[in-house]
Every structure is written in structure tokens, then in C-alpha cells.
């Protein structure tokens, strides 16, 4: 599959099902560092998202026998967030102590923020095709967690690409094609 | 070779309810999904509804509540119905094959066909 | 409500470039297909990119289609420009699984 985006490009396949993805993922070359920011024209008190990247993923899915005829497109929250407060008269060194002064109490991780819900269809090797539910990021965010917080749950915000679930429909069909719920 | 043609009359008055059909060849309506998309004189597209390879259907929700799609899988046809029609549904129709999702651009459509609604 | 916004009508002169635009209003549009349809004068739509940049057989390499997150829209680009590329052009993706067109732009080919 070929896509000229100017962002980090992830391509591999993933599984319809509740475990986790593929863990033998292959990982396409990356061709740029993702979003930049400019701290022109931000007021005093903006926090800018240094270092959180939303980077373009595209993902074929397959449950075995089917596969996905196109890549599933979403976005990947990677990178760590350095908060700063852009003063006027801003020096690396001052930021740096105030940072690292507080970096034992709390933390920021580069989290998914949006999310949509897209439906898929795998193409099957006997002609049919299966429909499933999947949901996407679709934005990136950087959010805060204190260090009590990380150590008592490491799940903060599915940082994996996503995960389908499959259930059955209640109303069944007289087809021989088949249709998945995921959420 | 793949084809999709619409049919049915061209003039339907108004509260009645507007049948067409579109008979597919070349693809089985098991492996593809079909929509139903129209275009009022000098304006754009409007899509109406669509039946799933899987015969599930699925509807553009202004027009839901006067709109049914159906097929008829041996004789290679899907259907349109759209009720209670009103001067506002003069528009050509047209059936179209789409590919699977994700993506699934429309890639045949049919000729089109004008109807018109009035008394 | 997820929209495709497109500008009425844009025009210009033989042998030169045009571009099309297709703003998508929420999200990030990298994560959506678009696609662009062409529909001449009484015929139906043809499509001329897929899948944000690609090129059916039979339509020429003057068509280009690019995706710029920058801005979130997608951009159709006809270079080259000949009398008979006069014609409507459609931007489409999906919301979720619901089809949406953006609402045409009339190329008028001077």
C-alpha cells in the first residue's frame, strides 16, 4: 500500500478479535517527525504540546480467513509531553529546574483525545465478506497523571493501536455473509 | 464487464411513492455494496441509502422514515422506494457499486435515470 | 456533523494548473479516505482519484489528488488543463459508514 504522508507511517496487520494485536507488527520508515509547533504568538500562560506526535497509521485487518481489501487509517499518540510556560523572557535552564522538580509527583503522556467509531468489511476467500465495528483515533492529546496514579493503573489511555471486539448481532440474516459489532 | 442500469418511470405524482430497480451485471451484490444516490437539477449529489454486501441496508436519515432498499440476489437487482413523494424529490437517480470499506469509492454508476414528481 | 466544503467554482485558462479543494470540518483528515468523481455536462459521475491519490486506469497523470493535514482538506490538482477536464468535480469520504459529498465545483475551462 502505498501513502505519501508527511507523517510517521505504521503499516501491519492486525486481528478482529478481543486479545491484543499482532505482536510481529512491521514498522514502515518514517519520513518526518510528525506535527511541529511555534510558540509565536501564544500568551503567557499556553502550555505547548512538545513532543506529542500524531502519526498516520494504516492497518490491514484480517480474522483468518478474511481480510480487509484497504488498510484501516488512524492515527498513533506517540512521543513524551514537555509542558512549558512560554514566558517572555523564557531560558531552558529555569524550565529545566522547574520541571524536573516536579517530575516526581506527576507526569504527562501523549494519550489519545478523539475518537470515532468506523466500520470495516474483510473480504473472505469463499467470496463473502464480514462486517465489523471498529473504533479509530482520530486526535492526540497531552494529559497529566500523577505518579500515585500511574503506579495504582497502568491502563491510562489505550496508547495500542485499536483493538476490534467481536460480538454477535442479536437479529440474525439469512445471508452467508456475516456481520460483527466491535466496540 | 460490470454494469448498472436503473429503471422505472419517469414521472410520479406527488404523496405517491417512486419505485426504481437496478439490475447489476458482471458482480454479485454478496460481494459489493450498492447505494442509491440522486442529483436535483443543477445541484450536487445527495446520497439516499445503501444495501450492505451483507443485506444489511443503511439510510441517508432526512430521507429514512420515506426510504426502503431491498434486493433480489437470484435476479442480480436492488430496488428503491421512496414514499409520499414531493416536488422536492424531482432529481436523476442513480444506482451505484461501491467497494468495501474502509475506502469503498463508487466506482460503476448507472446511467441515471430522471424523475420527475408531478400532478 | 462531519462536512466536506468545497468552493463553487474555479476557473482558468488551457495548458495551465488548477486545484480543487475539499475541507473536511472536524477531525483529522488523515484518517479518512477521499476520493473525487468528475461529471461532464449530462453524463454521470467517472471517478478520477481514489483513495486519496490514486488514479483509476484510463484517467490521465494530469489528475493528482494529495491529502495536506495542515490545513485538513484534500486537493485535487489538474495540470495541464484541457477544454474537455470542463466539467463538475465531487469530493467523498464517509462518516463512519455513512457516504458524504462534498458539494461540487464547477471548472469552467476559459
Known amino acids: 500500500f502505498k501513502n505519501d504522508a508527511t507523517e510517521i507511517l505504521y503499516s501491519h496487520v492486525v486481528k478482529p478479535v478481543p486479545a491484543h494485536p499482532s505482536s510481529n507488527s512491521t514498522l514502515n520508515q518514517a519520513r518526518n517527525g510528525g506535527r511541529h509547533f511555534s510558540n509565536t504568538g501564544l500568551d503567557r500562560n499556553t502550555r505547548v504540546q512538545v513532543g506529542c506526535r500524531e502519526l498516520r497509521s494504516t492497518k490491514y485487518i484480517s480474522d483468518g480467513q478474511c481480510t480487509s481489501i484497504s488498510p484501516l487509517k488512524e492515527l498513533v499518540c506517540a512521543g513524551e509531553c514537555l509542558p512549558l510556560p512560554v514566558l517572555p523572557n523564557w531560558i531552558g535552564g529555569g524550565y529545566g529546574t522547574k520541571y524536573w522538580s516536579r517530575r516526581s509527583s506527576q507526569e504527562w503522556r501523549c494519550v489519545n483525545d478523539k475518537t470515532r467509531t468506523q466500520r470495516i468489511q474483510l473480504q473472505c476467500q469463499d467470496g463473502s465478506t464480514r462486517t465489523y465495528k471498529i473504533t479509530v483515533v482520530t486526535a492526540c492529546k497531552c494529559k497529566r497523571y500523577t505518579r500515585q496514579h500511574n503506579e495504582s493503573s497502568h491502563n491510562f489511555e489505550s496508547m495500542s493501536p485499536a483493538k476490534p471486539v467481536q460480538h454477535h448481532r442479536e437479529r440474525k440474516r439469512a445471508s452467508k455473509s456475516s456481520k460483527h459489532s466491535m466496540s | 464487464q460490470v454494469q448498472l442500469q436503473e429503471s422505472g418511470p419517469g414521472l410520479v405524482k406527488p404523496s405517491e411513492t417512486l419505485s426504481l430497480t437496478c439490475t447489476v451485471s458482471?458482480?454479485?451484490?454478496?460481494?459489493?455494496?450498492v447505494h442509491w444516490v440522486r442529483q436535483p437539477p443543477g445541484k450536487g449529489l445527495e446520497w439516499i441509502g445503501v444495501?450492505?454486501?451483507?443485506?444489511?441496508?443503511d439510510y441517508n436519515s432526512a430521507l429514512k422514515s420515506r426510504v426502503t432498499i431491498s434486493r433480489d440476489t437470484s435476479k442480480n437487482q436492488f430496488s428503491l422506494k421512496l414514499s409520499s413523494v414531493t416536488a422536492a424529490d424531482t432529481a436523476v437517480y442513480y444506482c451505484?457499486?461501491?467497494?468495501?470499506?474502509?475506502?469503498?469509492?463508487?466506482?460503476?454508476w448507472g446511467q441515471g435515470t430522471m424523475v420527475t414528481v408531478s400532478s | 456533523q462531519v462536512m466536506l466544503t468545497q468552493p463553487h467554482s474555479v476557473s482558468e485558462s488551457p495548458g495551465k494548473t488548477v486545484t480543487i479543494s475539499c475541507k473536511l470540518n472536524s477531525d483529522n483528515i488523515g484518517t479518512y479516505y477521499i476520493h473525487w468523481y468528475q461529471q461532464r455536462e449530462g453524463r454521470s459521475p467517472t471517478t478520477v482519484i481514489y483513495g486519496d491519490d490514486k488514479r483509476p486506469d484510463g484517467v490521465p497523470d494530469r489528475f493528482s489528488g494529495s491529502i495536506d493535514s495542515s490545513s485538513n482538506s484534500a486537493s485535487l490538482t489538474i495540470s495541464g488543463l484541457k477544454t474537455e477536464d470542463e466539467a463538475d468535480y465531487f469530493c467523498?469520504?464517509?462518516?463512519?459508514?455513512?457516504?458524504?459529498f462534498g458539494g461540487g465545483t464547477k471548472l469552467t475551462v476559459l
Open positions: 458482471g458482480f454479485s451484490l454478496t460481494s459489493y455494496n
Open positions: 451505484v457499486r461501491g467497494g468495501l470499506l474502509p475506502g469503498g469509492y463508487f466506482d460503476y
Open positions: 467523498h469520504s464517509y462518516d463512519d459508514h455513512i457516504p458524504i
Open positions: 444495501l450492505w454486501s451483507d443485506g444489511d441496508t
